[in-house]
């Protein structure tokens, strides 16, 4: 991953913080929030993007070359945006216009665009859809996707908070 211009860390921090709040509002838990289950193993997790040690999102990794981490976050945002665009969220039960889900979708797009280099090729993914006999699964899938997104965004927000605090170019005072 070549070194390229850094993002606007402060803006990313603000947007990611807002996204965390929207994801929470879109799927506020009744009771204790258990983002990641302790019994999950690697095999069951491999279809969900996670920010891991080797992604360079730790303070030292960000200092050395933040592009590795930003690429991982970009991939995760694209993955979740793709799911929010799918039949899982478009079908019944219908989501109200201007609902937290709609705002979440818009903000997710905003952060993606902020991180998306102009020349970055867009990956094409198969759009998941539910057959008529699977319609009942929709609320369960929505719940799982939003829980997973909450966990992803919580880590991404910490990355951007660290970047905003330590990697932002200081303003040079003019004489």
């Amino acid at each position: 991953v070549p070194r390229s211009s850094s993002p606007d860390w402060a803006q990313c921090q603000q947007l990611s913080r807002n996204l965390c709040m929207l994801a929470w509002n879109a799927h506020a838990p009744a009771g204790h929030m258990n983002l990641l289950r302790e019994e999950e193993d690697e095999e069951t997790k491999n279809n969900v993007p996670r920010i891991q040690c080797e992604d360079g999102c730790d303070p030292q990794g960000l200092k050395d070359n933040s592009q590795f981490c930003l690429q991982r976050i970009r991939q995760g945002l694209a993955f979740y945006k793709h799911l929010l665009d799918s039949d899982i969220f478009k079908g019944e039960p219908a989501l109200l216009p201007d609902s937290p889900m709609e705002q979440l979708h818009t903000s997710l797009l905003g952060l993606s665009q902020l991180l998306q280099p102009e020349d970055h090729p867009r990956e094409t993914q198969q759009m998941p859809s539910l057959s008529s006999s699977q319609q009942w699964q929709r609320p369960l899938l929505r719940s799982k996707i939003l829980r997973s997104l909450q966990a992803f965004l919580a880590i991404a927000a910490r990355v951007f908070a660290h970047g905003a605090a330590t990697l932002t170019e200081p303003l040079v005072p003019t004489a």
Partner: nanobody
Framework: EVQLVESGGGLVQAGGSLRLSCAAS????????MGWFRQAPGKEREFVAT????????YYADSVKGRFTISRDNAKNVVYLQMNNLKPEDTAVYYC??????????????WGQGTQVTVSS
């Protein structure tokens, strides 16, 4: 592993009510989506109702909408199915199931033994 035991079934007149319970043991079900399914004699098992892990979202088969209500008490590790205005066509063995999949898919991998509900006309 989660063990599920259904109870509350029985014989009831059309128009009557029953409340089914599904008690879980072996592990807390608070992280899992839960569902009720049923199987009538000579028919395939069919979906009745589901509830998300938090209880924040429920979904029903068209045939039971407005008559059945699914709920859960995570503190007690129990899921309920309140069945009102029962019809003869509701006669079936009712099964409780837990979605144990930790990926972004739905997989009801843990099932109870079922409880018989018979509605007479």
């Amino acid at each position: 592993e989660v063990q599920l035991v259904e109870s509350g079934g029985g014989l009831v007149q059309a128009g009557g009510s029953l409340r089914l319970s599904c008690a879980a043991s072996g592990r807390s079900i608070s992280s899992y989506a839960m569902g009720w399914f049923r199987q009538a004699p000579g028919k395939e098992r069919e979906f009745v109702a589901t509830i998300t892990w938090s209880g924040g979202s429920t979904y029903y088969a068209d045939s039971v909408k407005g008559r059945f209500t699914i709920s859960r008490d995570n503190a007690k590790n129990v899921v309920y199915l309140q069945m009102n205005n029962l019809k003869p066509e509701d006669t079936a063995v009712y099964y409780c199931a837990a979605d144990l999949s930790s990926g972004l898919d739905v997989d009801f991998g843990s099932w109870g033994q079922g409880t018989q509900v018979t509605v007479s006309s």
